[in-house]
């Protein structure tokens, strides 16, 4: 039960006090008791419940005509059952007794009021009155947890605007309101109560820049909402009429959880006594609601695809046709960024990561815009963000970044359980160097901090700085599977490729050519690849790098070897011993449900079929997956990327609610 104030009574004159329903009010009957008195009794109006405890141990007894010893160990508390119809209509009489004096009476006139700040603390999508039932001042995780949820209002419901909705202090329309969380103030008081009392809504100064609260005029259009709290206003005096009244507030978060903001925002209503104009206002009662800002959540390849993004660039029509066909098979919407908008930047995966935010009443896709800021810089802001599609970015917007800050270097695993610890939304994966050095690359700390602060997809740092581009999507992917954990981890594997080529040579296919049919590309015989000592040394190094990640992933995702599929792939080391795919990197694939868009490797054709394609199909088709090999050689591969790098996918949010997990 909420804490009320302390009321001191005195026999000299009647005491007038306010008691808020649902609070426990302490009665100090000792400090002003007549000197010779040694005991007391209490009588109260039917609407008042008095508890007297004489401890320790505390023996509680409801009032009757009994007398109690007048000593500091006696605790008297009041609660009120109903709100008062008029000021002071509930009475408590304390009678003091002494051996030689007649009884001395002290009178307390109580006004019972109902003041309750309600939000969706039960996470049902509805605001229900919760007075005296739950403590709204704490926020707890898990299926039995409680606490309200706020969305960062980071979409743009107004298409004429270039800013996010949370960047202005206006409510555009009902669409804008739906992105906010409802909070209701319920009051029931005597008609004249607010002539001597005031209600103030407030937020801590440390949180005022993270939240905005709009007050709605009930029954009127949303355009009647006016801002009452926010970055410029930590508190607001409310004009509340007496009697029974409900006041609606709409609350939007302005910031995502981050290293300097744990994501919790407390809104408090304070009842102030303003009856004495000569004195400052006195706090009579406070009620608070704590909200947690919904985290930004990534979606893994195992979530159903809803929309595919790609770029139109010079001469990639065939690539786009293949992606279009794949999207149609997977029943996905397709969005193509035209040449004039992408400015010859085709790397859609690197520019953005599409996740979502969720409250019980609303789910919103949100694009996380990377700070790489090349030709596609404007695409997430201008073309992706919009009505019911949010936007967030982090990191320096001018310089100070590396290739590891592109979001080909940001992936998320499917849900996993690791040594008994559940990650129902999976774990974020990003690449790093294995140790810091003068020229090693790492994901910008601001990005790392943001990802960690979301709490619900605890990040795992992998080693990717050995790659020229340096992205985790160059050596791993996840595909859905009907058995085991519901997915397989795919890892690029030089060892598997050498094994395959050796088998082909043993069967007399040593003359078969890699890169056959590619104009202006020097073809390589299987036997020459197998006999090239330098290439073998390079791939031995690459294998060690991938194996390091393999063990890391097994440990951090709780995987067994049988959860991993090795995809045959060779690499070559280029300048500064950085690795690049020797032929199109098949693990860098587009996963649309059971439909896979895999870079066409142009492997040796044996018996009319590419042996690399055949091998990959034999590994993936038993899982119910359909492999489509896409020619990305000149448009993507030779520019240091593949199909996954050149595409992006919006996926269906998890059915699991993030607040039901325990981070």
């Amino acid at each position: 039960m909420a804490q009320g104030t302390l009321i001191r009574v005195t026999p000299e004159q009647p005491t007038h006090a306010v008691c808020v329903l649902g609070t426990l009010t302490q009665l100090d009957i000792c400090s002003s008791a007549p000197e010779d008195c040694t005991s007391f009794s209490i009588n109260a109006s039917p609407g008042v419940v008095v508890d007297i405890a004489h401890g320790p141990p505390a023996k509680k007894k409801s009032t009757g005509s009994s007398t109690w010893p007048l000593d500091p160990g006696v605790e008297v508390t009041l609660t009120m059952k109903v709100a008062s119809g008029s000021t002071g209509d509930q009475k408590v009489q304390i009678s003091y007794y002494g051996p030689k004096t007649p009884p001395v009476k002290a009178l307390l006139y109580l006004t019972g009021v109902e003041i309750s700040l309600c939000a969706d603390i039960t996470r049902t999508g509805k605001v229900k009155p919760t007075r005296a039932v739950k403590d709204q001042r704490t926020w707890t995780w898990g299926p039995c947890g409680q606490g309200a949820i706020l969305l960062v209002n980071c979409d743009r419901d107004n298409l004429e605007s270039s800013a996010m909705d949370c960047e202005d202090d206006e409510v555009l329309d009902s669409e804008d309101l739906q992105d906010m969380s409802l909070m209701t103030l319920s009051t029931k008081t005597p008609k004249d109560f607010f002539t001597n009392h005031t209600l103030v809504l407030h937020v801590a100064r440390s949180e005022m820049d993270k939240v905005r609260v709009f007050q709605a005029t009930r029954g009127k259009l949303s355009s009647k909402c006016s801002v009452v709290l926010g970055p410029k206003w930590p508190s607001h005096y409310l004009m509340v009429p007496g009697g029974k009244h409900n006041m609606d507030f709409y609350v939007e978060a302005l910031a995502f959880p981050d290293t300097d903001f744990p994501g919790l925002i407390t809104l408090t209503i304070s009842l102030l006594d303003t009856s004495n104009l000569e004195l400052p206002e006195a706090v009579v009662f406070q009620d608070s609601v704590v909200f947690r800002v919904a985290p930004w959540i990534m979606t893994p390849n195992t979530q159903p695809p809803q929309e595919v993004y790609a770029c139109s660039i010079f001469e990639n029509e065939d690539f786009l046709k293949s992606v279009t066909t794949l999207a149609m098979k997977a029943k996905c919407k397709l969005t193509i960024c035209p040449e004039e908008e992408n400015m010859d930047d085709q790397w859609m995966q690197d520019e953005m990561e599409i996740g979502y935010i969720q409250a019980p009443h609303k789910t919103l896709p949100v694009v996380f815009d990377s700070p790489r800021n090349r030709g596609l810089k404007e695409f997430p802001i201008k073309r992706v963000m919009g009505p019911d599609f949010g936007y967030v970015t982090r990191g320096p917007q001018t310089g100070g970044i590396s290739g590891l800050d592109s979001f080909g270097n940001l992936e998320v695993s499917p849900p996993v359980t690791v040594r008994g610890k559940e990650y129902p939304l999976g774990r974020i994966l990003f690449g790093d160097s294995c140790y810091p050095s003068n020229d090693s690359r790492q994901m910008h700390q601001a990005l790392q901090d943001f990802l960690s602060a979301q709490q619900v997809q605890a990040p795992v740092k992998l080693y990717s700085d050995w790659l020229s581009v340096g992205h985790v999507d160059e050596f791993l992917s996840f595909v859905p599977a009907p058995d085991r954990k519901g997915f397989r981890l795919l890892l690029a594997s030089p060892r598997s490729c050498y094994k395959l080529f050796q088998e082909q040579q043993n069967e007399g296919h040593g003359e078969a050519l890699l890169f056959e049919g590619i104009k202006k590309k020097k073809q390589q015989k299987i036997k020459n690849i197998l006999s090239n000592k330098t290439l073998r040394e390079h791939n031995s190094f690459v294998e060690r790098c991938i194996d390091w990640n393999r063990e890391l992933l097994k440990r951090e995702l709780g995987l067994a070897e049988s959860d991993i599929i090795d995809i045959p792939q060779l690499f070559k080391l280029k300048e500064f011993s950085k690795a690049e795919a020797f032929f199109p990197n098949m693990v860098n694939m587009l996963v649309l449900g059971k439909h896979l868009g895999i870079p066409k490797p142009f492997g040796p054709v044996i018996n009319g079929r590419c042996c690399l394609e055949e091998k990959v199909c034999s590994l993936l088709e038993p899982l119910g997956l359909q492999c489509t090999f896409i020619n990305d050689f000149f448009t993507y591969h030779i520019r240091h990327g593949e199909v996954h790098c050149g595409t992006n996918v919006r996926r269906k949010p998890f059915s699991f609610k993030w607040w039901n997990m325990v981070p």
Epitope: S402, T534, L535, F582, R639
Partner: antibody, heavy 128, light 111 residues
């Protein structure tokens, strides 16, 4: 073959900044590794910085690390060297140089360590 | 003080051969096959004449040849000609924190 032209040099006070540009013509610079090399008056060559063709990693000499930043804009066919906190010992002719990354051998590393195309250089003078 | 050591100057008569040495350490010249040589005429930009120890870019006469033994690389110019008079610089990839090193340069005089 690509041709390179440096610009942006000039006189600057110690502690000041300059941004050098290296513009390419005759070919697409995105196919090339690019390095900056400098030569102080009457002295030898000193390697300064490198950026790979994919624009995904960079390297610096100890003498400039933390003060200089190399970057590239393949759409503009240019590479840049942002020089901050300049010192008197940074006075030199700055050359932009490149090596083609479009190599077809099974393994052909090393092209980022040599420079087969050079610009004519731009003079940077740091003096109060 | 340059990281790779070259003689300050060498000279030779037309038609003769000269060799310029470039001494490094086991962390650069001795470790990698990424040694290159540049020719620089006064007031001009350097020009690549040898890369990967002994390979010649197209257009460079076969009078120029490169080799390496241990931590020392060498440039040999046979059949010296007047236009060979220039400064010559060696360069190597290095595992040190500065990944490309140059020698201090050698002035070749054709007598």
């Amino acid at each position: 073959q690509v041709q390179l032209v440096e610009s942006g040099g000039g006189l600057v006070k110690p502690g000041g900044s300059l941004r050098l540009s290296c513009a390419a013509s005759g070919s697409t610079l995105s196919d090339y590794f690019v390095s900056w090399i400098r030569q102080a008056p009457g002295k030898g060559l000193e390697w300064v910085s490198f950026i790979n063709s994919a624009n995904t990693f960079t390297y610096y000499a100890d003498s400039v690390r933390g003060r200089f930043t190399i970057s590239r804009d393949n759409a503009k066919n240019s590479v840049y060297l942002q020089m901050n906190s300049l010192r008197a010992e940074d006075t030199a002719v700055y050359y932009c140089s490149s090596a083609n990354d479009d190599v077809d051998d099974i393994v052909a590393p090393g092209r980022g360590y040599y420079m087969d195309v050079w610009g004519r250089g731009t003079l940077v003078t740091v003096s109060s | 003080q340059s990281a790779l050591t070259q003689p300050r100057s060498v000279s030779g008569s037309p038609g003769q051969s000269v060799t310029i040495s470039c001494t490094g350490t086991s962390g650069d010249v001795g470790r990698y096959s990424h040694v290159s040589w540049y020719q620089q005429h006064p007031g001009k930009a350097p020009k690549l004449i040898i890369y990967n120890v002994y390979e010649r870019p197209s257009g460079v006469p076969d009078r120029f040849s490169g080799s390496k033994s241990g931590n020392t690389a060498s440039l040999t110019i046979s059949g010296l000609q007047a236009e060979d008079e220039a400064d010559y610089y060696c360069s190597s990839h290095s595992r040190s924190s500065t990944p490309v090193l140059f020698g201090g340069g050698t002035k070749l005089t054709v007598l």
